[in-house]
Amino acid sequence: IWELKKDVYVVELDWYPDAPGEMVVLTCDTPEEDGITWTLDQSSEVLGSGKTLTIQVKEFGDAGQYTCHKGGEVLSHSLLLLHKKEDGIWSTDILKDQKEPKNKTFLRCEAKNYSGRFTCWWLTTISTDLTFSVKSSRGSSDPQGVTCGAATLSAERVRGDNKEYEYSVECQEDSACPAAEESLPIEVMVDAVHKLKYENYTSSFFIRDIIKPDPPKNLQLKPLKNSRQVEVSWEYPDTWSTPHSYFSLTFCVQVQGKSKREKKDRVFTDKTSATVICRKNASISVRAQDRYYSSSWSEWASVPCS
Amino acid sequence: RAVPGGSSPAWTQCQQLSQKLCTLAWSAHPLVGHMDLREEGDEETTNDVPHIQCGDGCDPQGLRDNSQFCLQRIHQGLIFYEKLLGSDIFTGEPSLLPDSPVGQLHASLLGLSQLLQPEGHHWETQQIPSLSPSQPWQRLLLRFKILRSLQAFVAVAARVFAHGAATLSP
């Protein structure tokens, strides 16, 4: 058993049929010694008496808020949550496996630049009685500070018969060094509590590996005289690290016909302009990637050819 | 062309070669299904590699103030990785494919380090750790880790030279 926060405790349980559970000692936070009784949750049924109580916790019915009273007055509370371990593996019932980029990916994180700011998100089908708390650090043995905000519900989607809820959190490394080569990964830890079930999820990454620039901005076409060619130009996204002479991007320019089956013409360039042939009904798209490190491409920025 | 005396490096040449190094490092070890090598307990193997750290002056401001600290750090790293790529980690079993980019990568590391420090000049270099894994599978894993680490190192070096070529070239 360990304390998650004041008066909230997590009981770690090996979860199998007829498991003996854990014996947990509760002590009433009071100078009183006599006449103390204990109840669980909203029930008025007294389960035990005395300042200290030993309870066997083996299932969710044994978890909840234990309250000690004296003469009708509440003295203190202890909330017990359960963390299940089945076949040596901690349960992951609360969050959905996003399966990208690999199986057992519950947290996904992205950064728009090298400033030390990043966003993580996760999915669940649970809509109520759900709380998250997020902690992060750079490295684990001698951790350096990363400050995370509160997790918020950022999207709701309908998936077949189910509703899916996306939560996200923004974090910022306290003393980020955008130009340095990271040697210690960022660690992100999410505590999830659904009713009386506790679970924790972690992710470990270097900012460089989660970089995904915003799409290029101000994408424009300039027709070239007496030609089917156009000059496409664009700019670095506002959110990208500066100076651009140091934090450089590379770009992919694509000409795509109306039909998905039509052949795509692609050009790669380090410049912020390119000359391409603009076919009728086609569109021109440009996306960006870090020039020197193959992290994710941005989403496409597009303009129609016409 | 040399830097040790405080003179300026051939920024444009260094830029071109460092960008080539980036391409080679990624072709030598592309992101295979996002293989997370940090899960493989690599503390003892890749912790000793020289990293370009915050105080090394490789940021735009530090380069403007005095690029020597940064260039010396990059040089140390290039020599370190060049030695690693020439060691039995890469020359031993399992043999690299004949068309493997590791050979080119090795040569380019040497080339860039010589651009930074021609014959006759000496910066102190970091000792290469004695890593000699006994099993071929350990060697393979170590190669992946070294290449992943090299990708991060050369990315920072390439940024330094690109910025230098754009802003510090005479």
């Epitope: 049924e45 389960l47 309870i55 066997q56 916790v57 083996k58 019915g61 044994d62 | -």
Partner: nanobody
């Protein structure tokens, strides 16, 4: 009508063991929280242990010590195992449906003496 009938008490030497039983009827035993209490001569009721329908147990203090409560829902029976009996364990032992003993049996006498 609720009925609780304790048995298994008797005269035991110090250091000995006893297993008390309580046969329950007249209510849904399998979904009830059950208690063992005792009353020593000239003293008030003392709570010994609690067991929930699922078999999860609750004891006073920081450990179950010498007392072990258990139940068999199929037999509608509650048990109390007492080990290493001491003279101060001499008392009337009751099973009850509440910690105050408002619904309890007639009790079974345990006497610990050499």
């Amino acid at each position: 009508e609720v009925q609780l009938v304790e048995s298994g008490g008797g005269l035991v030497q110090p250091g000995g063991s006893l297993r008390l039983s309580c046969a329950a009827s007249g209510f849904t035993f399998s979904s009830s929280v059950m208690f063992w209490l005792r009353q020593a001569p000239g003293k008030g009721l003392e709570w010994l242990s609690t067991i929930k329908p699922t078999g999860s147990t609750i004891y006073p203090g920081s450990g179950k010590g010498r007392f072990t409560i258990s139940r068999d829902n199929a037999k509608n029976t509650l048990y109390l195992q007492i080990n290493n009996l001491k003279p101060e364990d001499t008392a009337l032992y009751y099973c009850a449906r509440d910690i105050g003993g408002t619904v309890r049996g007639q009790g079974t006498q345990v006497t610990v003496s050499s």
